[in-house]
Structures are given as C-alpha cells and as structure tokens.
Amino acid sequence: TPEVWVQVQMEATELSSFTVHCGFLGPGSISLVTVSWGGPDGAGGTKLAVLHPELGTRQWAPARQARWETQSSISLALEDSGASSPFANTTFCCKFASFPEGSWESCGSLPPSSDPGLSAPPTPVPILRAD
C-alpha cells in the first residue's frame, strides 16, 4: 500500500524558519503534490504550495521555497514573520497524486519538545484518501 511521510523541522540557525519534508512511498509516478497547513487539502486546510513535475511550482506566504528533493519527495521552507511562532502547533499535510494509485495524504507537525535542528520522525498519520 502506498504511504506518505511528513517531517517538520525547525531550523537551528533561524528559530522563525521551518522546513516541511514530504515523501511518497509506493509505485507509480507523481503527477502533483499539494502542501497545506491547518488541515488536509480541501478539508479546512490552507494551501501553501503545489508542485508539478512539468508545470513547475507555486508557493504562498508564509512559504518561501518549494522544491523537489527527489522524484518522490519535496521540501517546503517556511518563514514565520510574526513575533510568536504559529508553526509550532500547526499541522502540515502533504497530498501526493500519483498514477495509477490516486491521491494519498498524510499530516504531521513539529514535536512539542522540539529542539532547533531536530525533526519530527516520519509521521504516517495517514489520511489515506484514494481519490
């Protein structure tokens, strides 16, 4: 069964910066990745980035840079410009659309006791929606 993993990490050098890493474990080719925060895409979450292997990428503030790391994983850099960090308690969700499997989504967040530079373990809290 395909699986999506999500890691959220706080940057050691910049406490207001976070990076979300997501990956797809399974066969098939990725046709689209959507990253959202505050909940799943289409279910109360706010779209942060979309990545397409051919059409390119788009991101919306507070996301700063979305990029492919491998053919089946992405990273999204976020910058919290506010004085207090809303990211610390926020859920980030990644949805991978793949052919022929359909869509698979999983969510994760920064661990409560995170030290800068440490990342959350892979979190298959999968909302396994095969759309």
Partner: antibody, heavy 119, light 106 residues
C-alpha cells in the same frame, strides 16, 4: 467559464465603512486564492491582500492592515472586502482577482468596483 | 518587500512594429514574474506568467524572457487593440506590481 462579478459603484461619506462583493462562478470557489487589488485614479495597481476561501485564512499587504478586512461566504461563492474609516485616499477602483496557482497569478479578474469617498 | 522598477513609463509605437518593456526586481524573483494588460473601464488581463508562459488564448505576438532580477516583455506585429497599460507583477513572495507602461499605437 470562470467569472468574477463585482458589486456596483459606490458613493460614500468620509468616516463610513463599505463592503464590496465579488461573486465567483465557473470553478470550485474553495480551491483557489482570491485577491483584492486597488487602483487610484491615474495610478498603478496595488495588491491589498488575499483570502483562501477553503479555510478563510487571510494575508494582507502591511499597508492595508487595519483598513481592509477580507471574508467569504462559501455557500454563495462570494468574497467580500470591508473598507473602514474611509477617506478620500480610499477613492479608487477595487478589483477582485483569482490566483490560478500553477496557471499563474491573477488569471481571472472582476470588472472592478468604483468607490468615491466624498462629503 | 520586493520592489519592481518598470520602464519606460510610456511609449508610442507604430502599427506592425515591436515594443519591449523591462522590469527590474530588487532581488532575485526566481522567474516568478507575470505581465498583465489593462484597458480603461475593464479588469486587467493576464498575458504571461512564470516569465515566458503564455496564458491560454493569448497570441504568440506576446513574449517574455529574463531571469534573476531582470525581465523583459515584448509585443511584435503591433495591432490597434494593443493600446493599453501593461504591468509586470512579481509573485515570488507575496505580490508586487511594477509602475506600469502606457502604450500608444500610432
């Protein structure tokens, strides 16, 4: 066919508030960011802010924080912009515009709402 | 905030000719630049996004290029209906418009 229909022209007195509407059709309203843009007479375009209708999350240009408030009514696929404490500086044409994501920013625009603030 | 300096602010060109407008960003905007056409009394129209990608339905007379901080936009085989104000727009982080270029066709 994507269409953004804005409310009609308004003449209001200084100090008043006004809510402008933008009714979206032809696409899934909750899937795309909706932006508002200001154009003063004889001037260029200024981005006011955006709202993501699916979550009602907003992001404002610093210049318009406290001046504009963006909201949506998902049931009617309508976006609203409330402008408060109006002055002559707020006299302008206001546009709503959809962010098309990978299709590019501002891929569809409303026809504009003309606001005149005068006593 | 990212600033965009657009030039020229106005220009006049002949029917059938070619014009080029430039836009310089205050920092690298990673090709996230778009170009819009605006005619009085109407909503603006997206022509190009991601530096050089034509929006559906836009003729190939319109083109864009550039990278880093420097971008340009051209219209060839000018037609009467190209008379309008053109704006560049960066969307690398938030959104900022250039000052606009008013084009008159003679």
């Amino acid at each position: 066919q994507v269409h953004l229909q804005q409310s009609g022209p308004e003449l209001v007195k200084p100090g008043a508030s006004l809510k402008i509407s933008c009714k979206a059709s032809g696409y899934t309203f909750t899937d795309y960011y909706l932006n508002w843009v200001k154009q003063r007479p004889g001037q260029g375009l200024e981005w006011i802010g955006w709202i993501f209708p699916g979550s009602e999350s907003t992001f404002y240009n610093e210049k318009f924080k406290g001046k504009a408030t963006l909201t949506v009514d998902k049931s009617s696929s309508t976006a609203y912009m409330l402008l408060n404490s109006l002055t002559s500086e707020d006299s302008a044409v206001y546009f709503c515009t959809r962010d098309g994501g990978l299709r590019g920013p501002f891929d569809y625009w409303g026809q504009g709402t003309t606001l005149t603030v005068s006593s | 905030d990212i600033q965009l300096t657009q030039s020229p602010s106005s220009l006049s060109a002949s029917l059938g000719g070619k014009v080029t407008i430039t836009c310089k960003a205050s920092q690298d905007i990673n090709k996230y630049i778009a170009w819009c056409q605006h005619k009085p009394g109407k909503g603006p129209r997206l022509l190009i996004h991601y530096t050089s990608t034509l929006h559906p339905g836009i003729p190939s007379r319109f083109s864009g290029s550039g990278s880093g901080r420097d971008y340009s936009f051209s219209i060839s085989n000018l037609e009467p209906e190209d008379s309008a104000t053109y704006y560049c727009l960066q969307y690398d982080y938030l959104l900022t418009f250039g000052g606009g270029t008013k084009l008159e066709i003679k």
